[in-house]
């Protein structure tokens, strides 16, 4: 015969734990029931009654299966300088991160401690990782037959128009420019941009920064803004 | 509140070395990035550099990175910065800072230590 | 560095006159600008920081505009209490740096 299932409260079999989304209560030695993410414990269990659980008020919440007898508080609000990624819920704290065209350099738990400038890769050198929240730009010098005249933190390097006869080659910032005749392909006008990180699409009422520099970072342990690729603007 | 409490004036010789303590009180001492910048007499102020108590991250200013040195003693909330090699130029106030968000614009000082080098 | 140069070096206002301070950075610093106010004796005190945002309990005479490389700070009406050094710094990148200062005194 199948084990009876023992329903909360009940005391557990010597040297055994209590089930998953349990808990054992030392007051009362038995196993009892968690809250769910979002609840609290509004009544511990007892020898005879299992936990009360209670959702949690605004602007507090619990992450995770719990017992705790109040909710976590959220953060405070956004300053006007961050973007909220993650708004309060019961069951989640409010994230915020660095506004667009900043990346977190030095991350805390929920949010950023330090937020730096994406760096911008100058002509001649393009995109070859874009920056994500937690992340900066990489640069990388255009390989031959590409370029790029820009300096930004999305272009990329692209092929130089191929020309029927050449008035200037191009070089890796500078596209090719071809005699009046028109050139057997050519690309369609404008910079190839690779898609902006998270942070940078949010909508925001500050200006957005547009950095010409990269952070000129000097001795940093881990964590930290990485130093300037090559290629990328700055000292 | 937060209060940033630097210790007291210091006279030392040139080549000497300086440590200039800054105690932490009001906020979670490892939750904030703590910088510091100097101010020689009647001049403008120099950023120094940061450092991070949480987990000993560190950025110093390229002018300063072979003298200075900045550590913490978490157990007591204070940020710590050593200056050596010690020269006349280097007389001046030194400020410890933070910033409370992730942006670094200053907006808790210390009261600042008075540090004379000479001969 | 991205240097950042202040004027003019100083300044005399009459009372309740408008005074302007500039600052001038030498590469694109965004609006990641931020204005001090220092007393003698006293370390600086935050007033602005994101060119034009005003820090907590900072008096609404004070106001910041510019953008990219040039930056002003405005006092609309100067009060006695304002005779003091005004620092520009940019926060934009390390290293972190400061105008030179500009002294506002009374005419």
């Known amino acids: 015969l199948p084990a009876q299932v023992a329903f909360t409260p009940y005391a557990p079999e010597p040297g055994s734990t209590c089930r998953l989304r349990e808990y054992y209560d030392q007051t009362a030695q038995m196993c009892c029931s968690k809250c769910s993410p979002g609840q609290h414990a509004k009544v511990f269990c007892t020898k005879t009654s299992d936990t009360v659980c209670d959702s949690c008020e605004d602007s507090t919440y619990t992450q995770l299966w719990n017992w705790v007898p109040e909710c976590l508080s959220c953060g405070s609000r956004c300053s006007s300088d961050q973007v909220e990624t993650q708004a309060c819920t019961r069951e989640q704290n409010r994230i915020c991160t660095c506004r667009p065209g900043w990346y977190c350099a030095l991350s805390k738990q929920e949010g950023c401690r330090l937020c730096a400038p994406l760096r911008k890769c100058r002509p001649g050198f393009g995109v070859a990782r874009p920056g994500t929240e937690t992340s900066d730009v990489v640069c990388k010098p255009c390989a031959p037959g590409t370029f790029s005249n820009t300096t930004s933190s999305t272009d990329i390097c692209r092929p130089h128009q191929i020309c029927n006869v050449v008035a200037i080659p191009g070089n890796a910032s500078m596209d090719a420019v071809c005699t009046s005749t028109s050139p057997t392909r050519s690309m369609a006008p404008g910079a190839v941009h690779l898609p902006q990180p998270v942070s940078t699409r949010s909508q925001h009422t500050q200006p957005t920064p547009e950095p010409s520099t990269a952070p000129s970072t000097s001795f940093l342990l881990p964590m930290g803004p990485s130093p300037p690729a090559e290629g990328s603007t700055g000292d | 509140q937060v209060q940033l409490v630097q210790s007291g004036a210091e006279v030392k010789k040139p080549g000497a070395s300086v440590k200039v303590s800054c105690k932490a009180s009001g906020y979670t001492f490892t939750e904030s990035i703590i910088h510091w910048v100097r101010q020689a007499t009647g001049q403008g102020l120099e950023w120094m550099g940061w450092f991070y108590p949480g987990s000993d991250n560190i950025n110093y200013n390229e002018k300063f990175k072979d003298r200075v040195t900045m550590t913490r003693n978490t157990s007591i909330s204070t940020a710590y910065m050593e200056l050596s090699s010690l020269r006349s130029e280097d007389t001046a106030v030194y400020y410890c800072?933070?910033?409370?968000?992730?942006?670094?614009?200053?907006?808790?000082w210390g009261q600042g230590t008075t540090v004379t080098v000479s001969s | 560095d991205i240097v950042m140069t202040q004027s003019p070096d100083s300044l005399a206002v009459s009372l309740g006159e408008r005074a302007t301070i500039n600052c001038k950075a030498s590469q694109d610093v965004s609006t990641a600008v931020a204005w001090y106010q220092q007393k003698p004796g006293q370390p600086p005190k935050l007033l602005i920081y994101w060119t034009s945002t005003r820090h907590t309990g900072v008096p609404d005479r004070f106001s910041g505009s510019g953008s990219g490389t040039d930056f002003t700070l405005t006092i609309s009406s100067l009060q006695a209490e304002d005779v003091a050094v005004y620092y520009c710094?940019?926060?934009?990148?390390?290293?972190?740096?400061f105008g030179q200062g500009t002294k506002l005194e009374i005419k």
């Open positions: 710094q940019h926060h934009y990148s390390t290293p972190y740096t």
């Open positions: 800072a933070r910033h409370e968000g992730p942006y670094v614009y200053f907006d808790y």
